[in-house]
Amino acid sequence: QHHGVTKCNITCSKMTSKIPVALLIHYQQNQASCGKRAIILETRQHRLFCADPKEQWVKDAMQHLDRQAAALTRNGGTFEKQIGEVKPRTTPAAGGMDESVVLEPEATGESSSLEPTPSSQEAQRALGTSPELPTGVTGSSGTRLPPTPKAQDGGPVGTELFRVPPVSTAATWQSSAPHQPGPSLWAEAKTSEAPSTQDPSTQASTASSPAPEENAPSEGQRVWGQGQSPRPENSLEREEMGPVPAHTDAFQDWGPGSMAHVSVVPVSSEGTPSREPVASGSWTPKAEEPIHATMDPQRLGVLITPVPDAQAATRRQ
């Protein structure tokens, strides 16, 4: 599907510091119309970051992901490339959006409502540029207080675009860069693997999925400080980005009937985002059902006001 309009709809003004390719599942080049070229990286926790395509680590990461995608197709999967405008699979969770990032509205005349369809376990495992894609992460955020040095050097903290809720594999990202080689865009990769048949009560995963590839001191209490991160036991550990009063985990764990109301708020270009644990007792929705959202055309940023269903509850212990 080729869209006639390739208006820039993701603007990056701040680039992330390096992220290990082991944690990346996909990359996407933004449109030429954006002026400032950037690579949009998606992590295994479905967080999106802008990266500078000129940096060596970004080049290496893209090359690595390309190789993985090639290996996937060699192993009997199919790989569909789509050309068009950059479009997230699902509604962006504004809580994770960086204050320097602007999401533009759709400019194709289509509805800007993004409605992913729930997918089967097989489909969840099948989507992406590499076999690493863990689209099934539902409500288990890896976010926490980062090591101090990284937080200070302008690392990934504060550069996150938004968290992609891993609820759909039917929708795809599309690239407006037809010259981009290989799997530099969302693809549907169909593999022959079967979903786990183990007892779901144990949350089991089997080794049937294709794979390319604490220090717990016995004595004394752990002292938290520079270079280490505390692990709050009963907090939601959500990430609050600048003035946007929403959380990156906003789309994790949505229950049936949950709805996201997306409206627009100005996004400050100043201020350092914090990664503070949120007090327990807050709700977190379930990512099993479609998410409905509409984008206000007057955009500077996005404010998401989740409306939980009656059963929404905390997902932490």
């Epitope: 894609l133 689209t135 890896g142 990284k150 690392g155 590839e213 036991e233 009963n234």
Partner: antibody
Framework: EVQLVQSGAEVKKPGATVKISCKAS????????IHWVQQAPGKGLEWMGW????????KFNERFKGRVTITADKSTNTAYMELSSLRSEDTAVYYC???????????????WGQGTTLTVSS | DIQMTQSPSSLSASVGDRVTITCRAS??????LAWYQQKPGKAPKLLLY???TLAEGVPSRFSGSGSGTDYTLTISSLQPEDFATYYC?????????FGGGTKLEIK
Amino acid sequence: EVQLVQSGAEVKKPGATVKISCKASGYTFTNYYIHWVQQAPGKGLEWMGWYLPGDDSPKFNERFKGRVTITADKSTNTAYMELSSLRSEDTAVYYCATSPTDETQGDYFDYWGQGTTLTVSS
Amino acid sequence: DIQMTQSPSSLSASVGDRVTITCRASGRIHDFLAWYQQKPGKAPKLLLYTDNTLAEGVPSRFSGSGSGTDYTLTISSLQPEDFATYYCQQFWSTPYTFGGGTKLEIK
């Protein structure tokens, strides 16, 4: 205090299957990746795979693919590593570990279980 | 896969000595390297990680350096408790790989 406590030593015959447990405490179990690392006698360390409890997308080292299963019971905060079709070269100490950093920072391992010794012998 | 080659495989030194252990990756790992110390019968203990950050509680005599594919762990003044085996680990890409280890013994 974060702790990972593993099950006791096991002796198995070739061809059998072993299931080693790793009980976590002191942090939110479902938030952090559990990794399994093998250390054969007199050998170095070898990463086997990762698993986020509650996620259905584990990642495995190709060398162990097809023989290893990583699961978790969220109700007891316990992760499991099952290794099948055992052979003598699987005789090793198996460690569970977690990666502590923000998700973008990478998987180095700052918390480790005490290790479980597996002996495979006929 | 990225191979990690550690050298030397063993090293004899005395208390107070300055020692260096090197780790070479078969490809760029962009400073996503960790160093561990392991004593017999114990689990490895994290010493340093990404960009040579010292792990919590690790003495400042341990330091790391390097970039690209070549990395070094330095112990500025050996203490009796430092005699152990040291491993490097890359976590740039999966499968995560460790060096073969360097056994540091008392001379």
